[in-house]
Amino acid sequence: AILGRSETQECLFFNANWEKDRTNQTGVEPCYGDKDKRRHCFATWKNISGSIEIVKQGCWLDDINCYDRTDCVEKKDSPEVYFCCCEGNMCNEKFSYFPEMEVTQPTSNPVTPKPPYYN
């Protein structure tokens, strides 16, 4: 392993369709991929009237957007699909939404000092 890089070997697995899909709702997914590629964990969820509904969690393939992210944080402002990815075993157990504020926004809108975490 490269020094400073958190290798991902397993991730929290969750499938919201578990009853329909008849797979276990929650588990630990071992991550595989090409030897020269990095592996990550991810979480994707919906926000329905302030209520968080996890869609799926599990392993994610080599993605530059996930490099060196130890926390699973969605930074897009009001995304259609909430998605985050990270590096490190089970790093997707907790995930958060912490939109990056644009400079043009009025200062009367306070920036949340810490991202709200869901798990």
Epitope: F13, N15, N17, K20, D21, R22, T23, N24, G27, E29, P30, C31, Y32, T44, V55, K56, Q57, G58, C59, W60, L61, V81, F83
Partner: antibody, heavy 120, light 107 residues
């Protein structure tokens, strides 16, 4: 790198059953997510069901519920798809396929396919 | 069951052209959409997953976009080996369903 090798072509009578095997080589078989997809001659692709061997339980498309059984034998790294009460419209190439991840990102490694012909 | 539709069902193009194939889902599938290429007598090949991620080893002239119910596959600077049939597939919920395919032919 995973490789999937399927059993040979079959000719079956209507009303009978067929069991197609799919032997995997490569990393830990029990951790794979395996699906079965079929394609009738000149037609599109149809997902039949899938299994994660470590969990054992399979899930099936409603269309095939009660007629298809997907199993996995960890000792031989082989997945099986059995289809019963065969009819002429079951004539197709049957593929076993590995998924990229358990969350079904995409079907990345395909077996060579097994042609099943149902004819009286 | 989520029904996938594709358009056009077939199209003719020349080497060097750029073509776009559209896939629609009968209900939202988030970004759980993959694209496959299939040549006669061969198994399909995964090109794109999660709507826009290029599968390892696939040339960068293939690109995907979209989310929810509307997705596109674009092939820029068509090469002779790109003439084939293309399928989309949703894996948001079972049964995972495929589009009927788009046949790309040489003009």
């Amino acid at each position: 790198q995973v490789q999937l090798v399927q059993s040979g072509a079959e000719v079956k009578k209507p009303g009978s059953s067929v069991k197609v095997s799919c032997k995997a080589s490569g990393p830990r078989f029990q951790d794979l997510s395996i699906s079965w997809v079929r394609q009738a001659p000149g037609q599109g692709l149809e997902w039949m069901g899938g299994i994660i061997p470590i969990y054992g339980t399979a899930n099936y498309a409603q269309k095939f519920q009660g007629r298809v059984t997907i199993t996995a034998d960890e000792s031989t790294s082989t997945a099986y798809m059995e289809l019963s009460s065969l009819r002429s419209e079951d004539t197709a190439v049957y593929y076993c396929v590995k998924d990229l991840t358990w969350t079904n990102l995409g079907l990345d490694i395909w077996g060579q396919g097994t042609m099943v012909t149902v004819s009286s | 069951e989520i029904v996938m539709t594709q358009s056009p069902s077939s199209l003719s193009a020349s080497v060097g052209d750029t073509v776009t194939i559209t896939c629609r889902a009968s209900q939202g599938v988030s970004r759980w959409l993959a694209w496959y290429q299939q040549k006669p007598g061969k198994a399909p090949r995964l090109l794109i997953y999660w709507a826009a991620h290029l599968q390892s080893g696939v040339p960068s002239r293939f690109s995907g976009s979209g989310s929810g119910t509307h997705f596109t596959l674009t092939i820029s600077s068509l090469q002779p080996e790109d003439f084939a049939t293309y399928f989309c597939q949703q894996s948001y919920s079972t049964p995972f369903t495929f589009g009927p395919g788009t046949k790309l032919e040489i003009k």
